[in-house]
Protein backbone atom coordinates (compact mmCIF):
# COMPACT_ATOMS: atom_id res chain seq x y z
CA UNK A 1 0.00 0.00 0.00
CA UNK A 2 1.04 3.66 -0.24
CA UNK A 3 1.53 3.72 3.52
CA UNK A 4 4.64 1.73 4.36
CA UNK A 5 5.11 2.00 8.12
CA UNK A 6 7.41 4.89 9.01
CA UNK A 7 10.64 3.63 10.53
CA UNK A 8 11.18 4.58 14.17
CA UNK A 9 14.69 3.31 14.96
CA UNK A 10 17.52 5.62 13.90
CA UNK A 11 20.03 3.93 11.59
CA UNK A 12 22.54 6.77 12.03
CA UNK A 13 23.15 6.24 15.75
CA UNK A 14 21.72 7.78 18.95
CA UNK A 15 20.57 11.40 18.75
CA UNK A 16 21.39 11.77 15.05
CA UNK A 17 17.86 11.37 13.65
CA UNK A 18 14.92 13.78 13.81
CA UNK A 19 13.95 14.44 17.45
CA UNK A 20 12.81 17.13 19.84
CA UNK A 21 15.56 19.09 21.56
CA UNK A 22 15.47 21.88 24.13
CA UNK A 23 17.17 25.13 23.13
CA UNK A 24 17.84 28.01 25.54
CA UNK A 25 17.16 31.51 24.27
CA UNK A 26 17.00 34.95 25.88
CA UNK A 27 14.47 37.62 25.00
CA UNK A 28 17.38 39.50 23.42
CA UNK A 29 18.15 36.51 21.17
CA UNK A 30 14.58 36.65 19.92
CA UNK A 31 14.38 40.43 19.67
CA UNK A 32 11.52 40.41 22.15
CA UNK A 33 13.01 42.34 25.07
CA UNK A 34 10.97 45.47 24.30
CA UNK A 35 7.58 43.83 24.55
CA UNK A 36 7.85 40.60 26.54
CA UNK A 37 8.37 40.81 30.31
CA UNK A 38 8.69 37.17 31.21
CA UNK A 39 10.03 34.63 31.11
CA UNK A 40 13.44 36.32 30.65
CA UNK A 41 15.04 33.06 29.57
CA UNK A 42 12.97 30.78 27.36
CA UNK A 43 13.33 27.07 27.01
CA UNK A 44 12.21 26.29 23.51
CA UNK A 45 11.84 22.83 22.08
CA UNK A 46 12.77 22.48 18.43
CA UNK A 47 13.01 19.70 15.90
CA UNK A 48 16.54 18.77 14.95
CA UNK A 49 18.34 15.87 13.32
CA UNK A 50 18.40 14.05 10.01
CA UNK A 51 15.66 12.21 8.17
CA UNK A 52 17.11 9.01 6.75
CA UNK A 53 14.97 6.91 4.40
CA UNK A 54 11.43 6.47 5.81
CA UNK A 55 12.39 7.56 9.34
CA UNK A 56 9.31 9.07 11.05
CA UNK A 57 7.59 9.83 7.74
CA UNK A 58 4.88 12.42 8.25
CA UNK A 59 2.61 10.93 5.58
CA UNK A 60 2.44 9.33 2.14
CA UNK A 61 3.94 12.45 0.53
CA UNK A 62 7.01 12.22 2.79
CA UNK A 63 7.47 8.55 1.92
CA UNK A 64 7.33 9.37 -1.80
CA UNK A 65 9.75 12.26 -1.26
CA UNK A 66 12.21 9.94 0.52
CA UNK A 67 12.00 7.43 -2.29
CA UNK A 68 12.42 10.00 -5.07
CA UNK A 69 15.28 11.69 -3.21
CA UNK A 70 17.10 8.35 -3.38
CA UNK A 71 16.55 8.28 -7.16
CA UNK A 72 16.86 11.99 -8.02
CA UNK A 73 18.86 13.60 -5.20
CA UNK A 74 19.62 16.75 -7.22
CA UNK A 75 15.94 17.32 -8.02
CA UNK A 76 14.10 16.10 -4.93
CA UNK A 77 15.29 17.10 -1.46
CA UNK A 78 15.32 14.63 1.43
CA UNK A 79 12.46 14.97 3.93
CA UNK A 80 13.36 17.26 6.81
CA UNK A 81 12.65 17.36 10.51
CA UNK A 82 9.79 19.69 11.41
CA UNK A 83 7.19 19.97 14.18
CA UNK A 84 4.25 17.58 14.02
CA UNK A 85 2.50 19.36 16.90
CA UNK A 86 2.93 22.31 19.24
CA UNK A 87 2.56 23.07 22.95
CA UNK A 88 0.74 26.27 23.88
CA UNK A 89 2.81 28.68 25.99
CA UNK A 90 1.92 31.90 27.80
CA UNK A 91 4.00 35.07 27.50
CA UNK A 92 3.67 38.16 29.68
CA UNK A 93 3.49 41.25 27.46
CA UNK A 94 4.05 44.91 28.08
CA UNK A 95 1.06 46.90 26.82
CA UNK A 96 0.17 50.61 26.80
CA UNK A 97 -2.00 50.03 29.84
CA UNK A 98 0.40 47.77 31.72
CA UNK A 99 0.82 44.04 31.35
CA UNK A 100 -1.20 41.24 29.76
CA UNK A 101 -0.91 37.51 29.25
CA UNK A 102 -1.09 36.00 25.79
CA UNK A 103 -1.13 32.38 24.76
CA UNK A 104 0.83 31.27 21.68
CA UNK A 105 -0.23 27.99 20.13
CA UNK A 106 2.58 27.70 17.58
CA UNK A 107 5.69 28.74 19.43
CA UNK A 108 7.07 25.57 21.06
CA UNK A 109 7.23 22.23 19.28
CA UNK A 110 5.78 19.19 21.06
CA UNK A 111 6.60 16.46 18.55
CA UNK A 112 8.61 16.03 15.37
CA UNK A 113 8.37 14.13 12.12
CA UNK A 114 10.01 14.03 8.71
CA UNK A 115 8.10 15.93 6.00
CA UNK B 1 4.49 41.12 17.95
CA UNK B 2 5.68 37.52 17.72
CA UNK B 3 4.38 37.40 14.15
CA UNK B 4 6.69 39.43 11.95
CA UNK B 5 5.27 39.24 8.45
CA UNK B 6 6.81 36.35 6.51
CA UNK B 7 8.87 37.60 3.59
CA UNK B 8 7.54 36.63 0.17
CA UNK B 9 10.18 37.88 -2.24
CA UNK B 10 13.16 35.58 -2.68
CA UNK B 11 16.50 37.27 -1.91
CA UNK B 12 18.44 34.41 -3.54
CA UNK B 13 17.14 34.93 -7.06
CA UNK B 14 14.30 33.41 -9.14
CA UNK B 15 13.40 29.80 -8.38
CA UNK B 16 15.93 29.43 -5.56
CA UNK B 17 13.57 29.84 -2.61
CA UNK B 18 10.93 27.46 -1.28
CA UNK B 19 8.29 26.78 -3.95
CA UNK B 20 6.09 24.08 -5.46
CA UNK B 21 7.61 22.10 -8.31
CA UNK B 22 6.24 19.33 -10.51
CA UNK B 23 8.24 16.10 -10.50
CA UNK B 24 7.75 13.16 -12.88
CA UNK B 25 7.88 9.63 -11.51
CA UNK B 26 7.12 6.15 -12.79
CA UNK B 27 5.25 3.47 -10.87
CA UNK B 28 8.57 1.63 -10.65
CA UNK B 29 10.22 4.69 -9.05
CA UNK B 30 7.58 4.60 -6.32
CA UNK B 31 7.51 0.82 -5.94
CA UNK B 32 3.85 0.82 -6.90
CA UNK B 33 3.86 -1.19 -10.13
CA UNK B 34 2.28 -4.24 -8.49
CA UNK B 35 -0.79 -2.49 -7.16
CA UNK B 36 -1.40 0.80 -9.01
CA UNK B 37 -2.54 1.18 -12.62
CA UNK B 38 -1.23 4.05 -14.72
CA UNK B 39 -0.84 4.33 -18.49
CA UNK B 40 1.65 7.18 -18.22
CA UNK B 41 4.16 8.73 -15.84
CA UNK B 42 2.79 10.22 -12.66
CA UNK B 43 3.06 13.92 -12.01
CA UNK B 44 3.69 14.87 -8.40
CA UNK B 45 4.16 18.30 -6.90
CA UNK B 46 6.76 18.73 -4.19
CA UNK B 47 8.21 21.54 -2.11
CA UNK B 48 11.77 22.45 -3.06
CA UNK B 49 14.14 25.36 -2.53
CA UNK B 50 15.84 27.17 0.31
CA UNK B 51 14.38 29.04 3.26
CA UNK B 52 16.35 32.24 3.77
CA UNK B 53 15.66 34.32 6.87
CA UNK B 54 11.89 34.77 7.40
CA UNK B 55 10.99 33.67 3.86
CA UNK B 56 7.46 32.17 3.89
CA UNK B 57 7.61 31.42 7.62
CA UNK B 58 4.99 28.83 8.52
CA UNK B 59 4.36 30.31 11.98
CA UNK B 60 5.93 31.90 15.06
CA UNK B 61 8.03 28.80 15.71
CA UNK B 62 9.56 29.01 12.23
CA UNK B 63 10.41 32.69 12.76
CA UNK B 64 12.12 31.87 16.06
CA UNK B 65 13.96 28.98 14.41
CA UNK B 66 15.21 31.30 11.65
CA UNK B 67 16.44 33.80 14.22
CA UNK B 68 18.15 31.21 16.44
CA UNK B 69 19.71 29.54 13.41
CA UNK B 70 21.40 32.88 12.69
CA UNK B 71 22.76 32.91 16.26
CA UNK B 72 23.48 29.20 16.79
CA UNK B 73 23.81 27.63 13.32
CA UNK B 74 25.45 24.47 14.69
CA UNK B 75 22.67 23.86 17.19
CA UNK B 76 19.53 25.11 15.43
CA UNK B 77 18.83 24.14 11.82
CA UNK B 78 17.44 26.62 9.32
CA UNK B 79 13.73 26.29 8.54
CA UNK B 80 13.08 23.98 5.60
CA UNK B 81 10.61 23.90 2.74
CA UNK B 82 7.68 21.56 3.39
CA UNK B 83 4.04 21.30 2.29
CA UNK B 84 1.58 23.71 3.87
CA UNK B 85 -1.38 21.94 2.27
CA UNK B 86 -2.19 18.99 0.07
CA UNK B 87 -4.35 18.25 -2.96
CA UNK B 88 -6.48 15.11 -2.85
CA UNK B 89 -5.72 12.75 -5.73
CA UNK B 90 -7.19 9.46 -6.90
CA UNK B 91 -5.20 6.30 -7.56
CA UNK B 92 -6.46 3.34 -9.57
CA UNK B 93 -5.67 0.19 -7.59
CA UNK B 94 -5.43 -3.35 -8.79
CA UNK B 95 -7.63 -5.55 -6.58
CA UNK B 96 -8.48 -9.25 -6.52
CA UNK B 97 -11.75 -8.45 -8.24
CA UNK B 98 -10.35 -5.98 -10.78
CA UNK B 99 -9.71 -2.28 -10.27
CA UNK B 100 -10.92 0.25 -7.73
CA UNK B 101 -10.42 3.92 -6.96
CA UNK B 102 -8.91 5.26 -3.77
CA UNK B 103 -8.48 8.89 -2.76
CA UNK B 104 -5.28 10.01 -1.01
CA UNK B 105 -5.41 13.31 0.84
CA UNK B 106 -1.70 13.57 1.63
CA UNK B 107 0.09 12.52 -1.52
CA UNK B 108 0.47 15.67 -3.62
CA UNK B 109 1.53 19.03 -2.15
CA UNK B 110 -0.61 22.07 -2.99
CA UNK B 111 1.37 24.80 -1.26
CA UNK B 112 4.69 25.21 0.53
CA UNK B 113 6.12 27.12 3.46
CA UNK B 114 9.23 27.23 5.61
CA UNK B 115 8.90 25.35 8.91
Amino acid sequence: SAHAHPRDSCPLGPGRCCHLETVQATLEDLGWSDWVLSPRQLQLSMCVGECPHLYRSANTHAQIKARLHGLQPDKVPAPCCVPSSYTPVVLMHRTDSGVSLQTYDDLVARGCHCA
Amino acid sequence: SAHAHPRDSCPLGPGRCCHLETVQATLEDLGWSDWVLSPRQLQLSMCVGECPHLYRSANTHAQIKARLHGLQPDKVPAPCCVPSSYTPVVLMHRTDSGVSLQTYDDLVARGCHCA
Epitope: - | L27, V36, S38, R40, Q43, T87, M92, V108
Partner: antibody, heavy 123, light 108 residues
Framework: QVQLVQSGAEVKKPGSSVKVSCKAS????????VSWVRQAPGQGLEWMGG????????NYAQKFQGRVTITADESTSTAYMELSSLRSEDTAVYYC????????????????WGQGTLVTVSS | SYELTQPPSVSVSPGQTASITCSGD??????VSWYQQKPGQSPVLVIY???NRPSGIPERFSGSNSGNTATLTISGTQAMDEADYYC??????????FGGGTKLTVLG
Protein backbone atom coordinates in the same frame (compact mmCIF):
# COMPACT_ATOMS: atom_id res chain seq x y z
CA GLN C 1 -21.09 25.07 -3.65
CA VAL C 2 -18.89 24.54 -6.71
CA GLN C 3 -19.92 26.41 -9.85
CA LEU C 4 -18.41 26.50 -13.32
CA VAL C 5 -19.59 29.47 -15.36
CA GLN C 6 -18.78 29.56 -19.06
CA SER C 7 -18.60 32.42 -21.54
CA GLY C 8 -21.44 33.12 -23.94
CA ALA C 9 -22.40 31.70 -27.33
CA GLU C 10 -20.15 32.42 -30.33
CA VAL C 11 -20.69 32.51 -34.09
CA LYS C 12 -17.49 31.99 -36.07
CA LYS C 13 -16.38 31.81 -39.69
CA PRO C 14 -14.68 28.68 -41.04
CA GLY C 15 -10.89 28.89 -40.65
CA SER C 16 -11.07 31.21 -37.64
CA SER C 17 -10.48 30.43 -33.96
CA VAL C 18 -12.68 30.51 -30.87
CA LYS C 19 -11.69 30.87 -27.21
CA VAL C 20 -14.16 29.76 -24.54
CA SER C 21 -13.67 30.51 -20.83
CA CYS C 22 -14.78 28.64 -17.71
CA LYS C 23 -14.64 30.41 -14.36
CA ALA C 24 -14.69 28.25 -11.24
CA SER C 25 -15.95 29.31 -7.84
CA UNK C 26 -16.55 27.57 -4.53
CA UNK C 27 -13.58 25.19 -4.56
CA UNK C 28 -9.79 25.13 -4.70
CA UNK C 29 -9.19 25.64 -8.42
CA UNK C 30 -5.65 24.25 -8.49
CA UNK C 31 -6.65 21.06 -6.69
CA UNK C 32 -8.70 19.66 -9.55
CA UNK C 33 -8.48 18.66 -13.19
CA VAL C 34 -10.51 20.66 -15.72
CA SER C 35 -11.54 19.08 -19.00
CA TRP C 36 -13.32 20.26 -22.11
CA VAL C 37 -16.02 18.03 -23.59
CA ARG C 38 -18.02 18.88 -26.68
CA GLN C 39 -21.38 17.74 -28.00
CA ALA C 40 -22.41 18.28 -31.60
CA PRO C 41 -26.18 18.76 -32.22
CA GLY C 42 -27.99 15.46 -31.59
CA GLN C 43 -24.69 13.66 -30.96
CA GLY C 44 -22.83 12.20 -27.99
CA LEU C 45 -20.12 13.54 -25.68
CA GLU C 46 -16.53 13.85 -26.93
CA TRP C 47 -13.54 14.57 -24.67
CA MET C 48 -11.16 17.14 -26.16
CA GLY C 49 -8.53 17.48 -23.46
CA GLY C 50 -7.88 19.01 -20.10
CA UNK C 51 -5.52 20.80 -17.75
CA UNK C 52 -4.37 20.35 -14.16
CA UNK C 53 -3.55 23.83 -12.84
CA UNK C 54 -1.31 22.59 -10.01
CA UNK C 55 0.93 20.80 -12.53
CA UNK C 56 0.49 23.42 -15.25
CA UNK C 57 0.22 20.73 -17.89
CA UNK C 58 -2.43 20.05 -20.51
CA ASN C 59 -3.31 16.79 -22.25
CA TYR C 60 -5.25 16.53 -25.50
CA ALA C 61 -7.25 13.84 -27.28
CA GLN C 62 -5.34 12.70 -30.35
CA LYS C 63 -8.15 13.89 -32.62
CA PHE C 64 -7.67 17.51 -31.48
CA GLN C 65 -3.88 17.53 -31.05
CA GLY C 66 -2.41 20.62 -32.72
CA ARG C 67 -5.77 22.36 -33.07
CA VAL C 68 -6.80 22.85 -29.45
CA THR C 69 -5.00 24.75 -26.68
CA ILE C 70 -6.16 24.52 -23.08
CA THR C 71 -4.81 26.95 -20.51
CA ALA C 72 -5.60 28.03 -16.97
CA ASP C 73 -5.20 31.25 -15.02
CA GLU C 74 -4.97 30.43 -11.32
CA SER C 75 -5.26 34.08 -10.29
CA THR C 76 -8.81 34.22 -11.66
CA SER C 77 -9.67 30.51 -11.30
CA THR C 78 -10.44 30.39 -15.00
CA ALA C 79 -9.74 27.72 -17.61
CA TYR C 80 -9.71 28.43 -21.34
CA MET C 81 -10.14 26.32 -24.45
CA GLU C 82 -9.05 27.68 -27.81
CA LEU C 83 -9.93 25.77 -30.98
CA SER C 84 -8.37 26.90 -34.26
CA SER C 85 -8.96 26.22 -37.97
CA LEU C 86 -12.69 25.94 -37.33
CA ARG C 87 -14.90 24.01 -39.72
CA SER C 88 -18.65 23.50 -39.87
CA GLU C 89 -18.41 20.15 -38.06
CA ASP C 90 -17.00 21.98 -35.00
CA THR C 91 -20.48 23.43 -34.43
CA ALA C 92 -21.30 22.09 -30.98
CA VAL C 93 -21.96 22.86 -27.34
CA TYR C 94 -18.62 23.00 -25.52
CA TYR C 95 -18.64 22.07 -21.83
CA CYS C 96 -15.98 22.49 -19.19
CA UNK C 97 -16.06 19.76 -16.56
CA UNK C 98 -14.18 19.39 -13.29
CA UNK C 99 -13.02 16.21 -11.62
CA UNK C 100 -10.41 14.99 -9.17
CA UNK C 101 -6.82 14.52 -10.30
CA UNK C 102 -6.52 10.85 -11.25
CA UNK C 103 -2.86 9.92 -11.04
CA UNK C 104 -1.54 8.74 -14.39
CA UNK C 105 -4.92 9.20 -16.07
CA UNK C 106 -5.41 12.83 -15.01
CA UNK C 107 -9.01 13.37 -16.20
CA UNK C 108 -12.40 11.73 -15.73
CA UNK C 109 -15.00 11.36 -12.96
CA UNK C 110 -16.52 14.70 -13.96
CA UNK C 111 -18.49 15.71 -10.89
CA UNK C 112 -19.20 19.33 -11.87
CA TRP C 113 -20.05 20.73 -15.31
CA GLY C 114 -20.39 24.22 -16.76
CA GLN C 115 -23.64 25.26 -18.41
CA GLY C 116 -22.15 24.82 -21.91
CA THR C 117 -21.23 27.29 -24.64
CA LEU C 118 -22.73 26.97 -28.10
CA VAL C 119 -20.20 27.62 -30.86
CA THR C 120 -21.67 27.89 -34.34
CA VAL C 121 -19.32 27.74 -37.33
CA SER C 122 -20.96 29.13 -40.44
CA SER C 123 -19.94 31.10 -43.47
CA SER D 1 -8.36 3.38 -29.79
CA TYR D 2 -10.81 1.94 -27.25
CA GLU D 3 -14.49 1.90 -28.20
CA LEU D 4 -17.56 1.77 -25.98
CA THR D 5 -20.83 0.61 -27.54
CA GLN D 6 -24.24 1.47 -26.10
CA PRO D 7 -27.72 0.66 -27.45
CA PRO D 8 -29.22 3.81 -28.99
CA SER D 9 -32.45 3.47 -27.00
CA VAL D 10 -34.04 1.59 -24.11
CA SER D 11 -37.70 1.76 -23.04
CA VAL D 12 -39.13 0.93 -19.64
CA SER D 13 -42.49 1.22 -17.87
CA PRO D 14 -42.68 3.35 -14.72
CA GLY D 15 -41.75 1.35 -11.62
CA GLN D 16 -39.90 -1.28 -13.65
CA THR D 17 -36.14 -1.85 -13.79
CA ALA D 18 -34.17 -0.32 -16.65
CA SER D 19 -30.82 -1.79 -17.70
CA ILE D 20 -28.48 0.16 -19.97
CA THR D 21 -25.41 -1.66 -21.23
CA CYS D 22 -21.99 -0.43 -22.28
CA SER D 23 -19.79 -2.90 -24.15
CA GLY D 24 -16.05 -2.75 -24.58
CA ASP D 25 -13.17 -5.15 -24.85
CA UNK D 26 -12.50 -6.53 -21.36
CA UNK D 27 -14.34 -3.56 -19.84
CA UNK D 28 -14.59 -5.50 -16.58
CA UNK D 29 -10.96 -4.57 -15.90
CA UNK D 30 -11.72 -0.85 -16.37
CA UNK D 31 -13.23 1.75 -14.08
CA VAL D 32 -16.54 2.89 -15.60
CA SER D 33 -18.57 6.02 -14.83
CA TRP D 34 -22.11 6.87 -15.96
CA TYR D 35 -23.57 10.29 -16.75
CA GLN D 36 -27.19 11.36 -17.11
CA GLN D 37 -28.10 14.19 -19.47
CA LYS D 38 -31.59 15.64 -19.70
CA PRO D 39 -32.62 17.70 -22.76
CA GLY D 40 -31.02 21.17 -22.75
CA GLN D 41 -29.01 20.45 -19.60
CA SER D 42 -25.40 19.63 -18.76
CA PRO D 43 -24.48 16.02 -17.95
CA VAL D 44 -24.57 14.80 -14.33
CA LEU D 45 -22.35 12.07 -12.86
CA VAL D 46 -24.63 9.31 -11.49
CA ILE D 47 -22.31 6.32 -10.96
CA TYR D 48 -18.54 5.86 -10.71
CA UNK D 49 -16.17 3.01 -9.83
CA UNK D 50 -18.55 0.06 -10.15
CA UNK D 51 -21.47 1.31 -8.09
CA ASN D 52 -20.57 4.45 -6.14
CA ARG D 53 -23.09 7.26 -6.24
CA PRO D 54 -22.19 10.93 -5.77
CA SER D 55 -24.19 12.69 -3.07
CA GLY D 56 -27.69 13.57 -4.21
CA ILE D 57 -28.02 10.62 -6.61
CA PRO D 58 -30.92 8.33 -5.61
CA GLU D 59 -30.27 4.77 -4.44
CA ARG D 60 -32.27 3.37 -7.35
CA PHE D 61 -29.20 4.00 -9.56
CA SER D 62 -26.58 1.25 -9.43
CA GLY D 63 -23.83 -0.13 -11.62
CA SER D 64 -22.08 -3.39 -12.34
CA ASN D 65 -19.17 -4.34 -14.55
CA SER D 66 -17.67 -7.66 -15.63
CA GLY D 67 -16.35 -9.34 -18.73
CA ASN D 68 -17.09 -7.20 -21.76
CA THR D 69 -20.16 -5.41 -20.40
CA ALA D 70 -20.81 -2.66 -17.86
CA THR D 71 -24.43 -2.08 -16.88
CA LEU D 72 -26.29 0.86 -15.38
CA THR D 73 -29.42 -0.33 -13.56
CA ILE D 74 -32.27 1.93 -12.53
CA SER D 75 -34.72 0.13 -10.26
CA GLY D 76 -38.23 1.51 -9.80
CA THR D 77 -37.73 3.80 -12.78
CA GLN D 78 -39.51 7.17 -12.56
CA ALA D 79 -40.60 9.57 -15.28
CA MET D 80 -37.88 11.97 -14.10
CA ASP D 81 -35.23 9.39 -15.09
CA GLU D 82 -36.02 9.88 -18.78
CA ALA D 83 -32.74 11.16 -20.24
CA ASP D 84 -29.68 10.24 -22.27
CA TYR D 85 -27.11 8.10 -20.44
CA TYR D 86 -23.40 7.91 -21.29
CA CYS D 87 -20.77 5.50 -20.02
CA UNK D 88 -17.16 6.67 -19.70
CA UNK D 89 -13.79 5.00 -19.21
CA UNK D 90 -10.19 5.42 -20.43
CA UNK D 91 -8.21 4.03 -23.35
CA UNK D 92 -4.77 2.41 -23.13
CA UNK D 93 -2.96 5.76 -23.12
CA UNK D 94 -5.22 7.26 -20.46
CA UNK D 95 -7.47 9.40 -22.66
CA UNK D 96 -11.13 9.76 -21.67
CA UNK D 97 -13.56 7.74 -23.82
CA PHE D 98 -17.36 8.08 -23.83
CA GLY D 99 -19.92 5.63 -25.14
CA GLY D 100 -22.28 6.83 -27.86
CA GLY D 101 -25.15 7.33 -25.42
CA THR D 102 -28.50 5.63 -24.79
CA LYS D 103 -31.84 7.41 -24.79
CA LEU D 104 -33.98 6.07 -21.93
CA THR D 105 -37.72 6.45 -22.52
CA VAL D 106 -40.12 5.95 -19.63
CA LEU D 107 -43.39 4.76 -21.17
CA GLY D 108 -46.83 6.00 -20.28
Amino acid sequence: QVQLVQSGAEVKKPGSSVKVSCKASGGTFRSYAVSWVRQAPGQGLEWMGGIIPIFGTANYAQKFQGRVTITADESTSTAYMELSSLRSEDTAVYYCARGPIIMGYQFGLFDHWGQGTLVTVSS
Amino acid sequence: SYELTQPPSVSVSPGQTASITCSGDNIGSHIVSWYQQKPGQSPVLVIYDKSNRPSGIPERFSGSNSGNTATLTISGTQAMDEADYYCQTWDSIGSVVFGGGTKLTVLG
